[in-house]
Every structure is written in C-alpha cells, then in structure tokens.
C-alpha cells in the first residue's frame, strides 16, 4: 500500500539515537525517499538503475541508513528534544511508471530525559 | 596504500555511539570490508558486481554503515563499555585483481561513564 | 521542455582524440543518468556508454572501453565524452541520450565524428 | 552480451495495412515481472524516438495504433494500421545488463 500502513513499527530505539523505518512496495525498482520533522527534511535517499541496470544510490545529507528492498530505514543519533515532533517519509516513484509522489503515513516522537550519554576518549 | 594509514580519523563522536571508519584505495571495485572487535566480527559489508555490472551490497549482519569510492564507515550504537578494546578492518579486494586480503590500520577505543542516556516515548 | 545539443564532432585522425559536449536544459541534470549512443552512417544504434548522477559508476561498451571516457559538470549542465586514440571504426554520429529511469526518452540532435587520415 | 536480432530487415508497407515487426533477444529479458525491453522509432536524419517500454507500455503522446508485446525472448512491435508518417527504422533494445544492446533495426519503406 503506497500510502503506507500501520503494520510496521515507524520508530525504534537504539541507545541514543532512533532508526526510523519507511516502507514502500516490493514492486517499487527506483525511488526517492525523503525523512521528513514537520517541514525539514532531514534525509534524502534516491536509488536509481542506468540502461544497463546498474544501481546508483545518492544520499546527499550523508544520513546513515539501510536500504532493503521494502524499506529505507534512516538512523538519527541526536533526535530534536526540544518537543515531541511529528516525523514522516515522502516516497517518489520513477520506476514502475507511472511517476507518483505520496507522504506515507508517519508518527509523533517524543523524547525525555534526554542528555549526553557517554564521552568517549580515542586513543589511535 | 593497501595497509591504511594513520592520515584519516578512524573514530568519530556521535551521540551514543561511534563510527569507525575504514579506508580502501578508491582503484578496488569490487571488496568485503568486515569491521573487528579483537577477534570478533562486528560487521561485514561486501560490494560486487554483476555480470551486467550492477552493483550488489550485502550486509549480512545488519550493520548501520554509509560506503563511499574510499571508505566504509560502520556505526555502533552500543559499543562494548566493559574495557578498552582494539578496533580494526580487514579488506578483501576481488577486483582489480589479484585477490588480496589486508587487515587495515587498527586503533584502541575506550568508552568511560557510559550510560543509557535517553528513553524514549513513541506515539504512532 | 527537455533539451539536449551535442557539439565539438569533427575530422580527426586516426589515433587522435576529440571532445563531445552535450548541453543539457529544461529538467534537474542531476537527477539522470546520461548516456553516449552512437550511429554509423547508414547503420544502426550502438551504445557508448553511461554514467550516473554523480559520475561514481560509469560503464562502457567493449569497442571503446580504454579508448573513451565519460565525464559530466552536473553546476554546468552538461556531459562529455572524451575520445581518445580513435579508429576508422569510430566514425559515427554521436547522440546524448536521457535515461529516463527505463527508456532512453530525450535524445539529442548529434554531432558526426569522422576519422579519416 | 545479450545479442538483440530483429525480422524483417525491411518491409514494404502501404497506408492501412497491419506491421508486425519482430525481436529476438539471445536470453531472457524477464526480471521481477517486467521485460526489460524497448521500441524506438528513427525517421531519416532525426534523432531516435522513444514508442514503446516494458515491451508493452506506450510512451507518453504515442498513438495508440503502435502496440508492443511479447515476453522473455521473443518481442513484437505492431502497427495496426500503418500511416504514411510511420515511415522510417524501427530498433528494439534491452536495458537487462550491461551492454544495453540494439537490435539491427527494421525499415518502413512504402510499397
């Protein structure tokens, strides 16, 4: 379902960070995906093939993330603690035709108790 | 220079957790890079190509990473806090060949006052 | 409206080099792989060779593969294939083509490439 | 590397009649249900024209009398009834691999 569905869990924890999972259709072969807080987006993954079926994958804002064939999963690893946020993703399709944008459904996160967790000393 | 070298941050900050960066000449097309912690596997990412030269990326470990021509950076999210411990990279190039298998510059990572540092609420 | 003009064909010798341009306008270059096809006279289509977005991955066809090479200047909208140590067999139209995700679907005009001593 | 061949070389054709023109390709074009294959047209010293991706899916303002179909290895481009401005070549190609290859083209000539 392109629109998106609440069959999946948007949101799960790691220590210190979040990994935000956006879900499209198996029969989707090229794409835009982008991570939305509010208005801002804060990641952008575009997987594309060439005519010779070579895949090319851009990630302009360096996001960490996870590329499955049903998913872009984005990790954040110092979420907006100010407030309680509403985060969504935004899926271009290019390939199957024909082209089509849709916001999938997306989810509030809140955080508390937020603080610098650990410092880390590097000895190299 | 296949061995690695010391010009290039290996560990980088990120709240709650560290990427380790492991570096490879930007010639190598086709690699596996696997991520160590002393004699254990953390992660393994492998780059082929197919007969058509699509490109093929398997991570079989599930491992957060962001590859580039350069580099493969690895992000742990819950390194071990129990001691100091030394981090390194093995590379094994297939193309261009002759095989080869390197294990790549090392460093100590020591993790202090580590803690859970946030909970978070998630409403969907 | 979607435009693409190639320049910079010519006579050449053979085991000389030249450099095609291919002018882009009308959509975000960027966003595409860009592709070289070329046409013998009275022949049929031959692919070149690719390359994508940000010029990371680029494939050639075997008869040009060490002879050519594809580059683009995504701030000048425009992709290049340089032509080195050309052969007889090279002499073509080259057209610039859009890949537009399956289907080459903008092509340019051309520029004929002759290599003759 | 995928050899594409195309039959016939070229056909003589009058206003109305049925085109059937054919495409072969050396192994199978099938991948996750689509056929990686497609149909341009060439009219005499233009540049190459998109009609037909997917084996079977028009190209945006193409009419609707070019139909293409077929699947795995064996292609078909039809023009059901062929207008004086079909004249021209006609060439599939396949995106499956790398090289992406042509086949030899088929020529609309009038009779």
């Known amino acids: 379902e392109i629109n998106g569905s609440a069959d999946h869990r948007m949101f799960s924890f790691h220590n210190g960070g979040v990994q935000i999972s956006c879900k499209y259709p198996e029969t989707v072969q090229q794409l835009k995906m982008r991570l939305f807080r509010e208005r801002e987006v804060l990641c952008e993954l575009t997987k594309t093939k060439g005519s010779g079926n070579a895949v090319s994958i851009k990630n302009p804002m360096l996001c960490l993330y996870h590329l499955s064939n049903n998913s872009v999963s984005f990790f954040l690893n110092n979420p907006d603690s100010s407030q309680g946020s509403y985060y969504f993703c935004s899926l271009s399709i290019f390939d199957p035709p024909p082209f089509q944008e849709r916001n999938l459904s997306g989810g509030y996160l809140h955080i508390y108790e937020s603080q610098l967790c650990c410092q880390l000393k590097l000895w190299l | 220079e296949i061995n690695g070298s010391a010009d290039h941050r290996m560990f980088s900050f990120h709240n709650g957790g560290v990427q380790i960066s492991c570096k490879y000449p930007e010639t190598v097309q086709q690699l596996k890079m696997r991520l160590f912690r002393e004699r254990e596997v953390l992660c393994e990412l492998t780059k082929t190509k197919g007969s058509g030269n699509a490109v093929s990326i398997k991570n079989p470990m599930l491992c957060l990473y962001h590859l580039s021509n350069n580099s493969v950076s690895f992000f742990l999210n819950n390194p071990d806090s129990s001691q100091g411990s030394y981090y390194f990279c093995s590379l094994s190039i297939f193309d261009p060949p002759p095989f080869q298998e390197r294990n790549l510059s090392g460093g100590y990572l020591h993790i202090y006052e580590s803690q859970l540092c946030c909970q978070l609420k998630l409403w969907l | 409206e979607v435009q693409l003009v190639e320049s910079g064909g010519g006579l050449v010798k053979p085991g000389g080099s030249l450099k095609l341009s291919c002018a882009a306008s009308?959509?975000?270059?960027?966003?595409?792989?860009m592709d070289w096809v070329r046409q013998a006279p009275g022949k049929g289509l031959e692919w070149v060779g690719n390359?994508?977005?940000?010029?990371?991955?680029?494939n050639f066809a075997p008869s040009v593969k060490g002879r050519f090479t594809i580059s683009r200047d995504n701030a000048k909208n425009t992709l290049y294939l340089q032509m080195n140590s050309v052969k007889s067999e090279d002499t073509a139209t080259y057209y610039c083509?859009?890949?537009?995700?399956?289907?080459?679907?903008?092509w340019g005009q051309g520029t004929l490439v002759t290599v003759s001593s | 590397d995928i050899v594409m061949t195309q039959s016939p070389s070229s056909l003589a054709v009058s206003a109305g009649d049925k085109v059937t023109i054919n495409c072969k390709s050396s192994?199978?074009?099938?991948?996750?249900?689509?056929?990686?294959l497609i149909w341009y047209q060439q009219k005499t010293g233009q540049a190459p024209k998109l009609l037909i991706f997917y084996a079977s899916t028009r190209h945006t303002g193409v009419p609707d009398r070019f139909i293409g179909s077929g699947s795995g290895t064996d292609f078909t481009l039809t023009i059901t009834s062929f207008q004086t401005e079909d004249l021209g070549d006609y060439y599939c190609?396949?995106?499956?691999?790398?090289?992406?290859?042509f086949g030899p083209g088929t020529k609309l000539e009038i009779k």
């Open positions: 083509a859009r890949w537009g995700h399956y289907a080459f679907d903008s």
């Open positions: 190609q396949h995106h499956y691999s790398s090289p992406p290859t």
């Open positions: 390359i994508d977005h940000d010029g990371n991955i680029i």
């Open positions: 009308g959509f975000t270059f960027s966003d595409y792989w």
């Open positions: 192994q199978s074009l099938l991948s996750s249900g689509y056929n990686y």
